[in-house]
Amino acid sequence: GSERTCCPVNWVEHERSCYWFSRSGKAWADADNYCRLEDAHLVVVTSWEEQKFVQHHIGPVNTWMGLHDQNGPWKWVDGTDYETGFKNWRPEQPDDWYGHGLGGGEDCAHFTDDGRWNDDVCQRPYRWVCETELDKASQEPPLL
């Protein structure tokens, strides 16, 4: 099959996923495209354990994740259900703040300096994290 069995060079393996941590900044859409060209996606945080892992690697730096509400409701880029899933917003967030003067509100989620999440203007050039799952194909249930 075409599934990955080990992580690419410069990626970090954790709990059957591979993570890549940028050291430069891009707008959210550009970061999303970067991950997709690497056959990955912006990181989708599904547990407190994964949150702590990512937080440990990024440090106290604003960093994009794969969560946005550009089309209305909040959505994870891989289709993980937002409403029932893990969340770690800062108090009073997300607030879709319009006071930044850049036009529009805030539609993209990022890790803040303490790891908790905030929504912000998608054009801001923040660092980002790509994620791809190992053995994607082999984890699917067998056909009956």
């Epitope: 075409s2 707008a27 550009d30 495209n33 060209l37 050039p125």
Partner: antibody, heavy 121, light 107 residues
């Protein structure tokens, strides 16, 4: 030795179709994103399209969106560019290129010699 | 789309000369910039990536620099084989875009 060899170019009438191929050798093809770049006569380089290693994600220049499809067959180590509804302004030398990986950026580190597409009636 | 404005469009120089080519991005692209050399009938060649990193096998007389949205390619001592056309390219955002090119000619 890492090599890319384009083929499939030729003379085609406006509105016609053409499929370009790029045969890769000397590296693990499926591990690398690939791209097409063109150069019209007397003009500069223009990025056309890119595709991820698995072929699952594709990207296009506005000038070709809807008329061009990039694809790859990793079992054959071959990259393709299907070009439809061709126009005179698509006349160019078409290069395929491999995207190298270094830390967090890939330049187009290996290029083919190019194949010429001429759109004319 | 991000515009890459390259200058000069051509430069006449002699062997041994120092040649500098400039590329200006229409918006911030961090260091997501590469430089290529193109000769007629030959495959293009990557010289510099991430604005200042020298591609393996490229002579050290080639160097790249970044200052905000301005990028430079410098050939410290021009050699006969360096007469060619040079292009910058940004990979910060799709669509990736190239500069218009700079032709380095023999004086």
């Amino acid at each position: 030795e890492v090599q890319l060899l384009e083929s499939g170019g030729g003379l085609v009438q406006p509105g016609g179709s053409l499929r370009l191929s790029c045969a890769a050798s000397g590296f693990t093809f499926s591990n690398y994103a690939m791209t097409w770049v063109r150069q019209a006569p007397g003009k500069g380089l223009e990025w056309v399209s890119a595709i991820s290693g698995s072929g699952g994600n594709t990207f296009y220049a506005d000038s070709v969106t809807g008329r061009v499809t990039i694809s790859r067959d990793n079992s054959k180590n071959t990259l393709y560019l299907q070009m439809n509804s061709l126009r005179a302004e698509d006349t160019a030398v078409y290069y395929c290129a491999k995207l190298g990986k270094d830390y967090h950026y890939y330049g187009m580190d290996v290029w083919g010699q190019g194949t010429t597409v001429t759109v004319s009636s | 789309d991000i515009q890459m404005t390259q200058s000069p469009s051509s430069v006449s120089a002699s062997v041994g000369d120092r040649v500098t080519i400039t590329c200006r991005a229409s918006q911030v692209i961090s260091n997501w910039l590469a430089w290529y050399q193109l000769k007629p009938g030959k495959a293009p060649k990557l010289l510099i990536y991430t604005a200042s990193s020298l591609q393996s096998g490229v002579p050290s007389r080639f160097s790249g620099n970044e200052s905000g949205t301005d990028f430079t390619l410098t050939i410290s001592s021009l050699q006969p084989e360096d007469f060619a056309t040079y292009y910058c390219q940004q990979a910060n955002s799709f669509p990736w875009t190239f500069g218009q090119g700079t032709k380095v000619e023999i004086k």
